[in-house]
């Protein structure tokens, strides 16, 4: 691959030679998911 990441799904996408755009989409959607998860946790 062309680099490394602490996110397994991003690591896989690098192995699959994904574009910077698709990696960015994955990273941003993961962040959105985490924010939503923390929001749900905080509202319990």
């Amino acid at each position: 691959g062309g680099g490394g990441s602490k996110h397994k799904c991003v690591q896989n996408s690098l192995v699959n030679n994904e574009t910077l755009e698709s990696i960015m989409n994955t990273l941003e959607s993961e962040e959105d998911f985490r924010k939503y998860f923390y929001y749900l946790e905080g509202s319990k």
């Epitope: 062309g2 680099g3 490394g4 990441s5 602490k6 996110h7 991003v10 690098l14 030679n17 994904e18 574009t19 910077l20 755009e21 990696i23 960015m24 990273l27 941003e28 993961e30 962040e31």
Partner: antibody, heavy 121, light 107 residues
Amino acid sequence: EVQLVQSGPGLVKSSETLSLKCTVSGGSISSSGYYWGWIRQPPGKGLEWIGSIHRSGSTFYNPSLKSRVTISVDTSKSQFSLRLTSVTAADTSVYFCGRHGRDYYYGMDVWGQGTTVTVSS
Amino acid sequence: DIQMTQSPSSVSASVGDRVTITCRSSQDINNWLVWYQQKPGKAPKVLIYGASRLQSGVPSRFSGSGSGTDFTLTISSLQPEDFATYYCQQANSFPLTFGGGTKLEIK
């Protein structure tokens, strides 16, 4: 207007570690849609990408340097950093930090001023 | 890795000339191609992104074309301030890679 200001020593001893920082002003390092990267340019030569980081901390490195490079981000200080270990004379270069994102098809639209790093024996 | 081959490596031209620089990628990169201008002692500056989109503030004498593996930067009428080194860069996938550069010199 986003600006990048680089800091760090211009002289590093052979076999030691090069450390540089890049501080983002006039905007947020946490803005969505950007990678923050490091590029270097040996004297009289072309541009070489070292690596990039996303605000999440996910990193992407040049395979030729991967074993020696660490890039990290500190969103609270609006900074990202480069560490290059076990330097040799071949690492003597001008080092630039930069931002690349969706707005410009991932071209580096904002650059730091450049830091000339000389590796001495 | 995607290799970027830029040609020529240097070119001598006069003010008013039309100059064309080419860049070829070893794999299809669609339009994920950026052109930079660099002057001595300065950081590179984006001229063209997305293969053909002109960066704000860049004179219209600069244009970019191409898609896939073959790309061109054209300066329609050279001005004194255009004498510099030009680089292409693929922004399709990591690792990011640059062409070797084209030094544009005064004839």
